[in-house]
Interface confidence: low
């Protein structure tokens, strides 16, 4: 579709049907800005403001932001997956853009130029219970893309999710597509974790999450990150794509249960 | 100290109209929801809607939707409750509560209530 | 009729330990969505108790705990004291787009 044409590279998701929107609370009430959940989540939520700390894992940095590690950061890659980046001005960023990649992509906003996007931006945002955790921009699973359109109605502004189906770039995901069925996309993802963690010689890969996978590469149900120290990482529920089914995680207050949800 | 301070008793008749406020103070009444719960005598809470002070957005519970209006005042940190077609079994007390999203959407701070009374 | 279910009433003596059920299906609660609990003592407003399935708001005495299982959400009083006896409401979201209360459970102190 026409609006698609500004966005650059499109992770493609499974479509947001009406099964999927009922699990989604309404977005919260007050927000200067609404965002996608993360990937391919369908729900939306509030994106942070410029200051505010952000990370891989975090809700998505607002309009004209990015989540940038301290110029000083030691291992940009392992701050922005302990969440300690700032939402910067976008500016300010591309002056470090060559310091930071080719690091996972950092937060930034779905209006970026293809430049950007293509630069190392990828939406990670997250929504009350509903913590998206595994990035999917790794496995290109769908022929929809999901884009926000904010309403202009001044007195009410409606926010609705948009499916369109994809009509460029799908050259880009054929062989991706190919190597989904001989791999899976859990391994998928687990091998380019490592590749970028060999690219930046990371030694000490603490912090940095590497997906559950079956035998035969696609997730497990249960999904956890690494523990630090003392303090359990937690764990949330996903389908053998490693879309989150709704709502269970744990900070490590208590054990999650996945053997009860379906897989899809 | 943050507070809700809510308007008074209201009597009214059947197919009446009835119109609560709700005074926000000690904080930022544009950074949180207003929320409108009611109890009829004796009985247990039920959730009515809610209204974003920051963009006016509602959301209302299906059971009232049409009789429903929820607004904003920002200019005065008022959120008005208008329930509309009045019955018997609209006689309650009507709270209205900040809703707090970064808590999962608990509502942390309470009005006092308005006490209305639906009788012919 | 409420969406989430809480036992009418308990009771305990000063000093006892009750538990208060919350339970909900799997559009609710089993869903996943948080659990916040209200104490509404007599002819006041209700006041947040727990929100987020097992947290405290400041103020609130660390003999109240909340937790959450599966579609079952109890809240846990400790040490119970004279003060306590009010009605006690769940709270959750539901998928068909609306915040849920359980029916309220009134605790009496024996």
């Known amino acids: 579709g026409a609006s698609s044409a500004g966005l650059g590279p499109v992770v493609r998701c499974e479509p947001c049907d009406a099964r999927a929107l009922a699990q989604c609370a309404p977005p919260p009430a007050v927000c200067a800005e609404l965002v996608r959940e993360p990937g391919c989540g369908c729900c939306l939520t509030c994106a942070l403001s410029e200051g505010q700390p952000c990370g891989i894992y975090t809700e998505r940095c607002g309009s004209g932001l990015r989540c940038q590690p301290s110029p000083d950061e030691a291992r940009p890659l392992q701050a922005l997956l302990d969440g300690r980046g700032l939402c910067v001005n976008a500016s300010a960023v591309s002056r470090l853009r060559a310091y930071l990649l080719p690091a996972p992509p950092a937060p930034g906003n779905a209006s970026e130029s293809e430049e950007d996007r293509s630069a190392g931006s990828v939406e990670s945002p997250s929504v009350s219970s509903t913590h998206r955790v595994s990035d999917p921009k790794f496995h290109p699973l769908h022929s929809k893309i999901i884009i926000i359109k904010k309403g202009h109605a001044k007195d009410s502004q409606r926010y609705k999710v948009d499916y369109e189906s994809q009509s460029t770039d799908t050259q880009n995901f054929s062989s991706e597509s190919k190597r989904e069925t001989e791999y899976g996309p859990c391994r998928r993802e687990m091998e380019d974790t490592l590749n970028h963690l060999k690219f930046l010689n990371v030694l000490s890969p603490r912090g940095v999450h590497i997906p559950n996978c079956d035998k035969k590469g696609f997730y497990k149900k249960k999904q956890c990150r690494p523990s630090k120290g003392r303090k359990r990482g937690f764990c949330w529920c996903v389908d053998k794509y490693g879309q989150p089914l709704p709502g269970y995680t744990t900070k490590g207050k208590e054990d999650v249960h996945c053997y009860s949800m379906q897989s899809k | 100290q943050v507070q809700l301070v809510q308007s008074g008793a209201e009597v009214k008749k059947p197919g009446a109209s009835v119109k609560v406020s709700c005074k926000a103070s000690g904080y930022t009444f544009t950074s949180y929801g207003i929320s409108w719960v009611r109890q009829a005598p004796g009985q247990g809470l039920e959730w009515m809607g809610w209204i974003s002070a920051y963009n006016g957005n509602t959301n209302y519970a299906q059971k009232l939707q049409g009789r429903v209006t929820m607004t904003t005042d920002t200019s005065t940190s008022t959120a008005y409750m208008e329930l509309r077609s009045l019955r018997s079994d609209d006689t309650a007390v009507y709270y209205c509560?900040?809703?707090?999203?970064?808590?999962?959407?608990?509502?942390?701070?309470w009005g006092q209530g308005t006490m209305v009374t639906v009788s012919s | 009729q409420a969406v989430l279910t809480q036992p009418p009433s308990v009771s305990g003596a000063p000093g006892q330990r009750v538990t208060i059920s919350c339970t909900g299906s799997?559009?609710?609660?089993?869903?996943?969505?948080?659990v916040h609990w209200y104490q509404q003592l007599p002819g006041t407003a209700p006041k947040l108790l727990i929100y987020?399935?097992?947290n405290r708001p400041s103020g609130v005495p660390d003999r109240f705990s909340g937790s959450k299982s599966g579609t079952s959400a109890p809240l846990a009083i400790t040490g119970l004291q004279a003060e306590d006896e009010a009605d006690y409401y769940c709270?959750?979201?539901?998928?068909?787009?609306?915040?849920?209360f359980g029916g309220g459970t009134k605790l009496t102190v024996l």
């Open positions: 987020g399935n097992s």
């Open positions: 509560a900040r809703v707090k999203w970064e808590l999962g959407w608990a509502f942390d701070i």
């Open positions: 799997s559009s609710n609660i089993g869903a996943g969505y948080d």
């Open positions: 709270q959750s979201y539901d998928s068909s787009l609306s915040t849920v």
